[in-house]
Interface confidence: low
């Protein structure tokens, strides 16, 4: 029998889906970290569904996330990083649905910023640089990024470039002259922690000179 | 019933290799980090090595770093200590223990009765 | 890495005395310390985790305190079967690292 049989609002609950999913982030406020989670299903009723993770804390056995519109979240500086939590999705006391999750292997790096792209025209190249706040952290230090670049006019036609330092150098032959271009960067954990890429940074936009006609080469 | 049995100990000349073994039943193995402690005769307990559930995570007491090496596999429910370029000074009884971080910190709230390694000429 | 020093490191004492163990940390390791209990020929047994949270089944009169670095384990009222050897721990989650005190070896007077 259902446990929520003098309860009409709740007596369909069961058959709702219930699945969601989480990130953390790891310092993210000073030593602070942040634990995020949603519903996988957008039209779920959350009206008194909370969510709860329990173990591989710190001190406590147990914490409540706070709710902010349609996603829930915690921040605190009580995870142990070792282990796995149990999250749970709850209606008063019962729990809907579990999830066992290590902490560490759901990591969402903050977006780079600071993205910028400077021409040397001796260089006949573009130096592309950005910034990321994991440099000076504890934990998530060490981070594969992406670096997405298009042709204004090709929507869809992105080139990517993996790399783990901050710095990139793109060849001026290998993009269009005179072409406006728009740059953009994500990071995901590498090395121990593991999880999903982050928000793309803010795009910049650059142009490519023309070409000199003389020479071949661009202006 | 939680338990842990270590195997694997012996009588060894120093510079050769010795494998030490950790079978674990009664709890859900591959929630745990698991630890290797060992204890000298007559003296205290000296942390070895230990790994996170998912073997991502290990750490080795600076004594036996490079020399040895903790390994799990999570489907025989087993912890391993491969421990080579033995020396006298490894002689000890090892003990493997389970980490219970649910608690909230690091305790070892499971211990085997420990294997004996003798590194002697 | 942090060091635990245990004081004293060895005590004598009467059934029903009052004793106390201190273990001080080279730095800050806020409440991550557990206290041990081994005895001979036996292994080792958690007593006390996060500080002063008594593990199940272990009774009342062992209680701990402390934190940052002054961490003290007591026994209040000592029963024949305390006599042993108290061990406290502390851990560091990443990188993954265990450190144990020297030990307190406490014996029948």
């Known amino acids: 029998e259902s446990g929520y049989a003098q309860n009409g609002d709740l007596e369909d609950a069961e058959l709702d889906d219930y699945s969601f999913s989480c990130y953390s982030q790891l310092e993210v406020n000073g030593s602070q970290h942040s634990l995020t989670c949603a519903f996988e299903d957008p039209d779920v009723n959350t009206t008194n569904l909370e969510f709860e993770i329990c173990g591989a804390l710190v001190e406590v056995k147990c914490l409540n996330f706070r709710k902010l519109q349609e996603i829930y979240f915690i921040e605190t500086k009580k995870f142990l990083l070792i282990g796995k939590s149990n999250i749970c999705v709850k209606v008063g006391e019962k729990s809907l649905t579990c999830k066992k999750i290590d902490l560490t292997t759901i990591v969402k790096p903050e977006a780079p910023f600071d993205l910028s792209v400077i021409y040397r025209e001796g260089a006949n190249d573009f130096v592309v640089t950005f910034n990321t706040s994991h440099l000076q952290k504890k934990y998530v230090k060490v981070l594969m990024h992406d670096v997405a670049y298009r042709q204004e006019k090709d929507e869809n036609k992105w080139t990517h470039v993996n790399l783990s330092s901050t710095k990139l150098t793109l060849l001026q032959r290998k993009l269009q002259p005179a072409a406006m271009y728009e740059i953009k960067v994500r990071s995901i954990p590498d090395h121990y922690f593991k999880g999903f890429w982050s928000e793309w940074s803010p795009s910049y936009y650059f142009r490519t000179p023309e070409i000199n006609n003389s020479s071949g080469e661009m202006d | 019933e939680v338990q842990l049995v270590e195997s694997g100990g012996g009588l060894v000349q120093p510079g050769r290799s010795l494998r030490l073994s950790c079978a674990a039943s009664g709890f859900t193995f591959d929630d745990h980090a698991m630890h290797w402690v060992r204890q000298a005769p007559g003296k205290g307990l000296e942390w070895v090595s230990g790994?996170?559930?998912?073997?991502?995570?290990?750490g080795y007491a600076d004594s036996v770093k490079g020399r040895f090496t903790i390994f799990r596999d999570n489907a025989k429910n087993s912890l391993y200590l491969q421990m080579n370029s033995l020396r006298a000074e490894d002689t000890a009884l090892y003990y493997c223990a389970k980490d219970e971080y649910s608690r909230g910190y690091y305790v070892l709230d499971v211990w085997g009765q420990g294997t004996t390694v003798t590194v002697s000429s | 890495a942090i060091q635990l020093t245990q004081s004293p490191s060895s005590l004598s004492a009467s059934v029903g005395d009052r004793v106390t163990i201190t273990c001080r940390a080279s730095q800050g390791i806020s409440s991550a310390l557990a206290w041990y209990q081994q005895k001979p020929g036996k292994a080792p047994k958690l007593l006390i985790y996060?500080?002063?949270s008594l593990e199940s089944g272990v009774p009342s009169r062992f209680s701990g305190s402390g934190s940052g670095t002054d961490f003290t384990l007591t026994i209040s009222s000592l029963q024949p079967e305390d006599f042993a050897t108290y061990y406290c721990q502390q851990f560091n989650s990443y990188p993954l690292w265990i450190t144990f005190g020297q030990g307190t070896r406490l014996e029948i007077k």
């Open positions: 790994i996170s559930w998912n073997s991502r995570g290990i």
């Open positions: 996060a500080a002063s």
